[in-house]
């Protein structure tokens, strides 16, 4: 973004920011904008919340266009009302082992997070909490009648994991990598993050990737076949170009996206991979960003609920699939 030109702001007055979000000047000192929050995409024009000690991490110097809002080195984490130092590991509950790093929390599930797809012998699999057990287990009860308004859109559930074995030992380093967070958006371009020490110096670092669970403009319900209640992985009719803050992917992609259900189930990524995507900006600059690509989706009743403070945080905010 060139800040040398005259300042001109959008025609509408200053935006009203949600509670807890600062109204700040953009990076050119021109216009008032709502500050981006931890883990959100940021640009010079869309700065991070300085009152929360956040800065826009652009990654490599070549990519000084779009970054991710990151807490300054050593920033503590507030989690479930407790403050954790950067670098500190803690067990948030019997289900998750977590690490605080520069204001971000990355967690690894201690319970199996497998997806159970419907089968003839178990048409309606459901995870339930059994007395005296920490981890939920799958049961095959008939589902309770569910009244649902509209399709269930979700970006939130854990997926099968690929990549380094979390317990791999390499050159005096216990390699640990948290799950990728769930995509920050249920539709459109979002961000997914994780914490890992899978690097030469065995130091914990945050990684981020772009993600798109489904395009926002797609009316996926229309594609559900008569008599069916879900469309798990809708066919995208033509290759698409991804857009990111005014920049467009240089290649077209025949990407897979997750569909929707009309019976209360959520369709979310099941297997994913991470690949680099090059974006070309209007000024000719090219930047490379890692992006999640969906291999398969799953539709399930294991939608995020609010009964477990950590579970809802886990599914809704930070953590999700592994590439």
């Amino acid at each position: 973004q060139n800040c040398s030109g005259p300042c001109r702001c959008p025609d509408e007055p200053a935006p009203r920011c949600p509670a807890g979000v600062s109204l700040v000047l953009d990076g050119c000192g021109c216009c008032r904008v709502c500050a981006k929050q931890l883990g959100e995409l940021c640009t010079e024009r869309d700065p991070c919340d300085p009152h929360k000690g956040l800065f826009c991490d652009f990654g490599s110097p070549a990519n000084r266009k779009i970054g991710v809002c990151t807490a300054k080195d050593g920033a503590p984490c507030i989690f479930g009302g407790t403050v954790y130092r950067s670098g500190e590991s803690f067990q948030s509950s019997c289900k998750y082992q977590c690490t605080c790093l520069d204001g971000a929390v990355g967690c690894m599930p201690l319970c199996s997070m497998d997806v159970r797809l419907p089968s003839p012998d178990c048409p309606f699999p459901r995870r339930v909490k059994l007395p005296g057990k920490c981890c939920e287990e799958w049961v095959c009860d008939e589902p309770k009648d569910q009244t649902v308004v509209g399709p269930a859109l979700a970006a939130y559930r854990l997926e099968d994991t690929f990549g380094p074995d979390p317990t791999m030992i390499r050159a005096n380093c216990l390699v640990q990598t948290t799950e990728w967070s769930a995509c920050s958006k249920t539709c459109g371009m979002g961000i997914s993050t994780r914490v890992t020490n899978d690097n030469a110096s065995c130091r914990l670092e945050k990684q981020s990737r772009l993600c798109m669970v489904r395009p926002c403009e797609a009316d996926l319900e229309e594609n559900i076949k008569k008599g069916k209640k879900c469309i798990r992985t809708p066919k995208i009719s033509k290759p698409i170009k991804f857009e990111l803050s005014g920049c467009t992917s240089m290649k077209t992609y025949r990407a897979k996206f997750c569909g929707v259900c009309t019976d209360g189930r959520c369709c979310t990524p099941h297997r994913t991979t991470t690949l680099p995507v090059e974006f070309k900006c209007p000024d000719g600059e090219v930047m490379k960003k890692n992006m999640m690509f969906i291999k398969t989706c799953a539709c399930h009743y294991n939608c995020p609920g609010d009964n477990d403070i950590f579970e809802s945080l886990y599914y809704r905010k930070m953590y999700g699939d592994m590439a």
Epitope: G5, C7, R8, P13, C28, R32
Partner: antibody, heavy 119, light 112 residues
Amino acid sequence: EVQLVESGGGLVQPGGSLRLSCAASGFTFSDYYMAWVRQAPGKGLEWVANINYYGSRTDLLASLKSRFTISRDNAKNSVYLQMNSLRAEDTAVYYCARDTSRGSYFDVWGAGTTVTVSS
Amino acid sequence: DIVMTQTPLSLSVSLGDQASISCKSSQSIVHYNEKTYLEWYLQKPGQSPQLLIYKVSSRASGVPDRFSGSGSGTDFTLKISRVEAEDLGVYYCFQGSHFPLTFGQGTKLEIK
């Protein structure tokens, strides 16, 4: 009623200094950029400087940057133009103007204050 | 610097007639946000300037609809469909898309 009132003009010798003030009323001052525009005797209009909502960004005519400074005090609903090392060619009527920062630039103008640089 | 050139420099019009003023910029005045900040101001005798038109063709609050602006790229026009006595004064075009912000040299409208 929206109003801008300039003050601080007068006769000054070359090399001297003046500080112009502009008092605003009738609108939420911190919601607007402010600007100074000048008009030499018998001549056209010339943009001098503008300043953002909080004073953290200022833009000035390049040829005046080393001598002129624009500032504001939102608590006093006022904008200022500090003029140093004045020259004969700085002689003009100096107008304070409200800049919407959005659709239009100068939607409200003051009556102006006259600065004369002469020995 | 972008030079704004107005023609004619003076204009004598009978009441009720149409007046047209041209303004040409020495280069494109499209801002990096893709909008064009071309404005017209009127300075009546002994008064401060007042905003008439902004963003090429939008009328400022309280400006009569006999004033209209048009144009794109580098060529812009202000039209007064039926000139009234109160319209006399000097008309300035202005570009706010690039630094330094610049005014045209002015067009003096007189009533015949």
